[in-house]
């Protein structure tokens, strides 16, 4: 199965895509795109380079690594849970069915917020949205957004997140980087 | 590999409960929501509610809420469905699933579990 | 609620065919939507989520289209292993399923 990589809504998501160019600034076509692998090409395309450059590009995806080198590592900036999903790094190597394919699982945490004193069943008017950042709503009553009578604290600093243990070592297995800025 | 394996077939009374359990294996309950979903006899699909094991917290289609109660055993990787004041129309085959992650569409099921309302 | 509508409740459809599938939502829930299979005596599959990308594994021959209330999945070169019930989920409100479309040889 596809390999997991996980962020916290609000911080940058990095999903690793290497290779090894067959000589210095021999570079082989990558694209990156939302949903899973096709047999050709890339679905939903977010970022392609060619031989020399990166050529496609949309708001909030970058290669922060060296790509003429080979790293083609994707960072998805600021992230939401509608980011969540799979994500293809397609190598484009020449020749008939040589590219080398990779499906990375991207899975977005929901921030945490503190509680506000109110209580749980409340909640039965309407329903937050669900991709936007986790909020939540009466006391013990976790969801994913925030209705318009309910007060949310502000979200943690990601400093204070990077203390949570568990989200320190969700992110130390899965190999995913947290860049912060 | 995931796996949610869901416990055996029931019949029961009108306005009994049951409790039905689903052991997911292959992965930790914790790190995902863990979704109830419904499917009556040649019907389509209904959501009851999912439960954020880490923190107990649930939320349930308002249709459910006063009958349903989803818990969740992180020690044995199970979760758990309570459905009260059964009747008749309550009669189909009940699936726990797991999200992608935090995002309610479900990529893995159980194999599902009929529930048989009968007196 | 949201309720999500599929107004075919039966397709009739031959291999190699090119079928779609609709779903209304009655109100705007943007992408989030997803679209699973359901084959006979067995647990649904997801295909499709937020609109449009495809799940691991999935073949090429299903697409998602669409947002705010219009939806479709479309097979391309219909195959017999897909004959199934095929269900739309939003997920912008608390889950809502719609009803179901059976897909059947003609």
């Known amino acids: 199965s596809e390999v997991e990589y996980r962020a916290e809504v609000g911080q940058n998501a990095y999903l690793p895509c290497f290779y090894t160019p067959a000589a210095p600034g021999n570079l082989v076509p990558v694209c990156w795109g939302k949903g899973a692998c096709p047999v050709f090409e890339c679905g939903n395309v977010v970022l392609r380079t060619d031989e020399r450059d990166v050529n496609y590009w949309t708001s909030r995806y970058w290669l922060n690594g060296d790509f003429r080198k080979g790293d083609v590592s994707l960072t998805i900036e600021n992230v939401t849970l509608a980011d969540s999903g799979i994500y293809c790094c397609r190598i484009q190597i020449p020749g008939i069915m040589n590219d080398e394919k990779f499906n990375l699982k991207l899975v977005i945490k929901p921030a945490k917020v503190t509680p506000a004193p109110t209580r749980q069943r409340d909640f039965t008017a309407a329903f937050p949205r669900m991709l936007t950042t986790r909020g939540h709503g009466p006391a013990e009553t976790q969801t994913l957004g925030s209705l318009p009578d309910i007060n949310l604290t502000q979200i943690s600093t990601l400093a204070n997140e990077l203390r949570d243990s568990r989200l320190a070592n969700d992110l130390r297995d899965s190999g995913a980087t947290i860049r912060i800025g | 590999e995931v796996q949610l394996q869901q416990s055996g077939a029931e019949v029961v009374r009108p306005g009994a409960l049951v409790k039905l359990s689903c052991k997911a294996s292959?992965?930790?309950?914790?790190?995902?929501?863990m979704h109830w979903v419904r499917q009556r006899p040649e019907q389509g699909l209904e959501w009851i509610g999912w439960?954020?094991?880490?923190?107990?917290?649930?939320i349930y289609d308002p249709k459910f809420q006063d009958r349903a109660s989803i818990t969740a055993d992180t020690s044995s990787n199970t979760a758990y469905l309570q459905l009260s004041s059964l009747t008749s129309e309550d009669t189909a085959v009940y699936y726990c699933a797991r999200d992608f992650g935090y995002v309610a569409w479900l990529v893995y099921w159980g194999q599902g579990t009929l529930v048989t309302v009968s007196a | 609620d949201i309720v999500m509508t599929q107004s075919q409740e039966f397709m009739s459809t031959s291999v190699g065919d090119r079928v779609s599938i609709t779903c209304k939502a009655s109100?705007?829930?943007?992408?989030?939507v997803a679209w699973y299979q359901q084959k006979p005596g067995q647990s649904p599959k997801l295909l499709i989520y937020?609109?449009?990308n495809r799940y691991t594994g999935v073949p090429d021959r299903f697409t998602g289209t669409g947002s705010g209330t219009d939806f479709t999945l479309t097979i391309n070169n219909m195959q017999s292993e897909d004959l199934a019930d095929y269900f739309c989920q939003q997920y912008s409100s608390y889950p809502t399923f719609g009803g179901r479309t059976k897909l059947e040889i003609k």
């Open positions: 109100q705007n829930v943007d992408t989030a």
């Open positions: 292959g992965f930790n309950i914790k790190d995902y929501y």
């Open positions: 439960i954020d094991p880490e923190n107990d917290n649930t």
């Open positions: 937020s609109a449009s």
